[in-house]
């Protein structure tokens, strides 16, 4: 679940520069599961640095021990940083934890690039600035890893929200969020909101920032404008979803949208960018390349590598498309759009500008594994994981970067036929032989 | 083959504009796989970033050279010019015009190079 | 702003022997650096590019290595007509405007 350009992630500031935020619209949503309103304990409980993943305050053990936890829609273990390491300033010591139980079972998870490996047990776990609630949850202790832990990052371990199919070593290992519902009377829904920077933060600042928020068990509306739009999940392993059409500046990418969703197309809050498989990735640059054409820019530049940098204030945002990613609806043969900026696929990078520039990445890259929607998506939007009645719900963040021409939109509804011939239908193997993480 | 040549005067007083003009021959300037560029190097120093165009009229310029440097191309003669106003000593250098070329990163093809000398 | 940083700033060799020159980045950038060969009184001509890539017509005694922070240009043996300056350039940060100091190979 952490591997290449999975992690490391970005995070940012809470609102966007100069007080850019679009007027709420009347709710025409249909009754949401859980509370309602306002979660006020739970707004800005995320932070993050440039690149390096949101993360969540949680306590393990009695007495409490305080760990910072990277928030991941894209796995579905619960697993901390348990032996010292050359890049954590704090982990989990299970000796000294009266509640400690060990499972005396080990996890194995190895990546394409990278793995982490540790003793399974459980223990008591809260999360301060969540629901006001302990419970005792399954704990992957990481004894081992390589090229899993991030030098600066200020995160110590991995929190699964995902569903208990992809759980390691097996499914029938209990994610945390499953067992916070069983054990408490919080419905089955959590929402982030996942606030990017929009510009490179220094050490500093970086430091200091806000990332976001994560709702547990209901909706805030004071973190999103205009209405919700929900897909279904289309299966619970990752949070599956099926992308029906594919628009770059309102034209059509005109493929067969069981491309757009080889093998999977799923919402990842642990990867970074807008991942395409490879036949859209290319037809989807040279459309941008083609709406962006009064400039040349690095090959470099398109496959995420090379940064492109212009004197600090003066992105030319105007001369890049929007991207819209089209989500089967809720009811049938109807769809919803969701569009995001350049100030959100170009990804700011920190530490390699001057204050004289503004420096920044390309955020859409190429995958093996299928769509994976991480931050460069979700920076836009304020995304609802409503578990409870399998959907998924899209509306337009309170927090996204934008500027006074455009904003990232959800819009709907849009007639689309015959949406279920999208879905890619994975031959059933030995699921032991599926590639653990995603490359 | 390719070729880039510079051109202007050799001589400029200071406070005053230096204008130079890089013709390219043998090929065209409107390929939309490279970018022409300017690179100067004063006396016995380094290599120095200037800045570079696109056939589309597009401009990149070295931060530090920004506010006096204009580079423009005219497609219809093949070539690219450079002007730096309010000209100093600090400015006397060999002038290179080049092609920017290999993934538009990397001056594969460049000028002779022209010396200008800022003096009253 | 990436600093490139060469050594040594002069190099005293004989034709024939083996040339190392070095280039260090103050951060990484990748394999997104090239080198450069400038004799007296002539431009610069491009020798490396991505680190280890080879321009067109560049005899292959010369070569680039590393990648990050870390890069070497190697001339494995030393003609009459490699005792010039050279330069290292990143464009991993992109306009490319960023040289090295240079290093000059001269005979011993």
């Known amino acids: 679940t952490h591997l290449g350009i999975r992690l490391p992630l970005r995070s940012g500031l809470a609102g966007p520069p100069l007080g850019l935020r679009l007027p709420r619209e009347t709710d025409e949503e249909s009754e949401e599961p859980g509370r309602r309103g306002s979660f006020v304990e739970m707004v800005d409980n995320l932070r993050g640095k440039s690149g390096q993943g949101y993360y969540v305050e949680m306590t393990v053990g009695s007495p409490p021990q305080t760990l910072n936890i990277l928030v991941d829609t894209g796995s579905s273990n619960f697993a901390v940083g348990a032996a010292p390491h050359p890049f954590l300033h704090r982990y989990y010591q299970r000796q000294l934890s009266s509640t400690y139980r060990d499972l005396r079972k080990g996890v194995y998870v190895p990546y394409t690039q990278g793995k982490w490996e540790g003793e399974l047990g459980t223990d008591l776990v809260s999360i301060p600035h969540g629901p006001n609630v302990t419970v005792r949850a399954n704990i992957a202790a990481i004894t081992e890893s390589d090229k899993f832990f991030i030098n600066g990052s200020n995160w110590e371990g991995i929190l699964g929200l995902a569903y208990a199919e992809i759980a390691r070593p097996d499914d029938s290992l209990e994610p945390f969020f499953d067992s916070l519902v069983k054990q408490t009377h919080i419905p089955n829904i959590f929402s982030l909101q996942l606030c990017g920077a929009g510009f490179p933060l220094n050490q500093t600042e970086a430091l200091a920032s806000v990332g976001g928020s994560m709702i547990i068990g209901g909706i805030d509306h004071s973190l999103y404008t205009g209405r919700l739009w929900y897909t279904p999940i289309r299966r619970e392993w990752y949070y599956e979803v099926i992308i029906v059409r594919v628009e770059i500046n309102g034209q059509d990418l005109k493929m067969d949208c069981k491309e757009y969703n080889y093998d999977k197309s799923i919402v990842d809050s642990g990867t970074t960018n807008l991942r395409l498989p490879k036949k859209v990735f290319e037809a989807a640059v040279k459309s941008i390349k083609a709406a962006s054409s009064t400039e040349k820019f690095p090959d470099g530049f398109w496959l995420g590598e090379q940064l492109v940098c212009w004197q600090a204030g003066t992105t030319p945002w105007n001369i890049f498309p929007v991207i819209s990613l089209y989500l089967m609806g809720e009811v049938t043969n109807q769809s919803f759009r969701i569009t995001i900026l350049p100030q959100q696929y170009l990804r700011p990078v920190e530490d390699v500008a001057t204050s004289q520039d503004d420096c920044y990445k390309f955020a859409v890259s190429q995958s093996s594994t299928g769509t994976v929607m991480g931050a460069v998506i979700m920076e836009g939007f304020y995304v609802v994981f409503d578990r409870a009645r399998k959907r998924i719900g899209f509306a337009v963040s309170a927090c996204h970067v934008h500027d006074e021409f455009r904003t990232a939109a959800v819009e709907g509804p849009f007639v689309t036929a015959d949406m279920e011939d999208c879905g890619y239908n994975i031959p059933q193997t030995d699921e032991s032989t599926l590639m653990t993480g995603r490359a | 083959q390719l070729q880039l040549q510079e051109s202007g005067p050799g001589l400029v007083k200071p406070s005053e504009t230096l204008s130079l003009t890089c013709t390219v021959s043998?090929?065209?300037?409107?390929?939309?796989?490279?970018?022409w560029g300017w690179i100067r190097q004063p006396p016995g120093k380094g290599l120095e970033w200037i800045g570079m165009i696109y056939y589309s009229g597009s401009t990149w310029y070295n931060p530090s050279l920004r506010s006096r440097v204009t580079i423009s191309v005219d497609t219809s003669k093949n070539q690219f010019s450079l002007k730096l106003s309010s000209v100093t000593a600090a400015d006397t250098a060999v002038y290179y015009c080049?092609?920017?070329?290999?993934?538009?990163?990397?001056?594969?093809?460049w000028g002779r190079g022209t010396l200008v000398t800022v003096s009253s | 702003e990436i600093v490139l940083t060469q050594s040594p700033a002069t190099l005293s060799l004989s034709p024939g022997e083996r040339a190392t020159l070095s280039c260090r980045a103050s951060q990484s950038v990748s394999s997104y650096l090239a080198w450069y060969q400038q004799k007296p009184g002539q431009a610069p001509r491009l020798l490396i590019y991505?680190?280890?890539k080879r321009a067109t017509g560049i005899p292959a005694r010369f070569s680039g290595s590393g990648s990050g922070t870390d890069f070497t240009l190697t001339i494995s043996s030393l003609e009459p007509e490699d005792f010039a300056v050279y330069y290292c350039?990143?464009?991993?940060?992109?306009?490319?405007?960023?040289f090295g100091g240079g290093t000059k190979v001269e005979i011993k």
């Open positions: 043998g090929g065209s300037i409107s390929s939309s796989s490279y970018y």
């Open positions: 080049a092609r920017v070329g290999h993934g538009v990163s990397y001056f594969d093809l």
């Open positions: 350039q990143q464009v991993y940060t992109w306009p490319p405007r960023t």
């Open positions: 991505d680190a280890s």
